[in-house]
């Protein structure tokens, strides 16, 4: 979800934004800081064993509006928050996993990973 009330049509920032990155640092990052023309993000999702894993990093402007919208994915507990208001703003983002639905218990521990939703570096 967006934290700073931006319009849905992404427009180019006049300047580069620096974000903290963790588990999601591109090659051009330095000291766990990445650079982007889009958004900083923090995401929490369950790994294959059901353990919550937090990742953070940069989303390029192109496609980031869709990714930051955090549309629910069947059989996957995941939440993402995005921000642009200052450098490393994602240090202060703390998304939480959505609550378990009854269906999730019935379906068992099979989680369909949809990595293309958040590995969007061009």
């Amino acid at each position: 979800k967006k934290e700073d009330g931006e319009s849905t049509a992404p427009t180019a920032r006049p300047k580069v934004l620096r974000c903290k990155c963790h588990h999601h640092c591109p090659e051009d990052s330095v000291n766990n800081i990445c650079s982007t023309d889009g958004y900083c993000f923090t995401m929490i999702e369950e790994d294959d064993s059901g353990t919550p894993v937090v990742t953070s990093g940069c989303l390029g402007l192109e496609g980031s509006d869709f990714q930051c919208r955090d549309t629910p994915i069947p059989h996957q507990r995941r939440s993402i928050e995005c921000c642009t208001e200052r450098n490393e703003c994602n240090k202060d983002l703390h998304p939480t996993l959505p609550p378990l639905k009854d269906r999730d218990f019935v379906d068992g521990p099979i989680h369909h990973k949809h990595h293309h939703h958040h590995h969007h570096h061009h």
Partner: antibody, heavy 116, light 112 residues
Framework: QVQLQQPGADLVKPGTSVKLSCKAS????????MQWVKQRPGQGLEWIGE????????MYNQKFKGKATLTVDTSSSTAYMQLSSLTSEDSAVYYC?????????WGQGTTLTVSS | DVVMTQTPLSLPVSLGDQASISCRSS???????????LHWYLQKAGQSPKLLIY???NRFSGVPDRFSGSGSGTDFTLKISRVEAEDLGVYFC?????????FGSGTKLEIK
Amino acid sequence: QVQLQQPGADLVKPGTSVKLSCKASGYTFTSYWMQWVKQRPGQGLEWIGEIDPSDTYTMYNQKFKGKATLTVDTSSSTAYMQLSSLTSEDSAVYYCARFGYYVDYWGQGTTLTVSS
Amino acid sequence: DVVMTQTPLSLPVSLGDQASISCRSSQSLVHSTGNTYLHWYLQKAGQSPKLLIYKVSNRFSGVPDRFSGSGSGTDFTLKISRVEAEDLGVYFCSQSTHVPFTFGSGTKLEIK
């Protein structure tokens, strides 16, 4: 039009510190980073670091950490670079430059001479 | 740090000639956003550098169309189709993909 005004020259003694200034006009100061670049004769251009005036976030070239400190005064749209423990190696032209994703405007540069 | 290697160091030309300057980087300048942050500047004697080309091939406002940039990855070229007297000076390439940002050592364009 975009202008970055820097004093033309400064003469300082070895071992002292100096604070170079760069006054920006013609644009919204907080909408762009300000970079500082060193140029010594025959040694090309060296990136010192940058500061985002909107949140005073800084990034430095490791080579200049401990040597340069970048600050801003948003009320006067002025960027500053303090250089400490000066030696003859610090004698150079220092440019401030506006940066978004690339430097598009440069100041005229301050020629710093470190001499006793 | 990314090393930017410019060739030639000196480029003697006659007015009206085409000039070509090469810039090679020690690693790819394609940023994780997909942009390539390679830029060209001209520094005339006693002046500060001026932006000519940004992001490989985009001419900055007011820059004549005789200047063009091309390339990708690690290999970039600046071309001046017909050199004029006002084009003389030192040309630098620069990258802002990787911190610390780095510059080429410069190519001096001079009259033959």
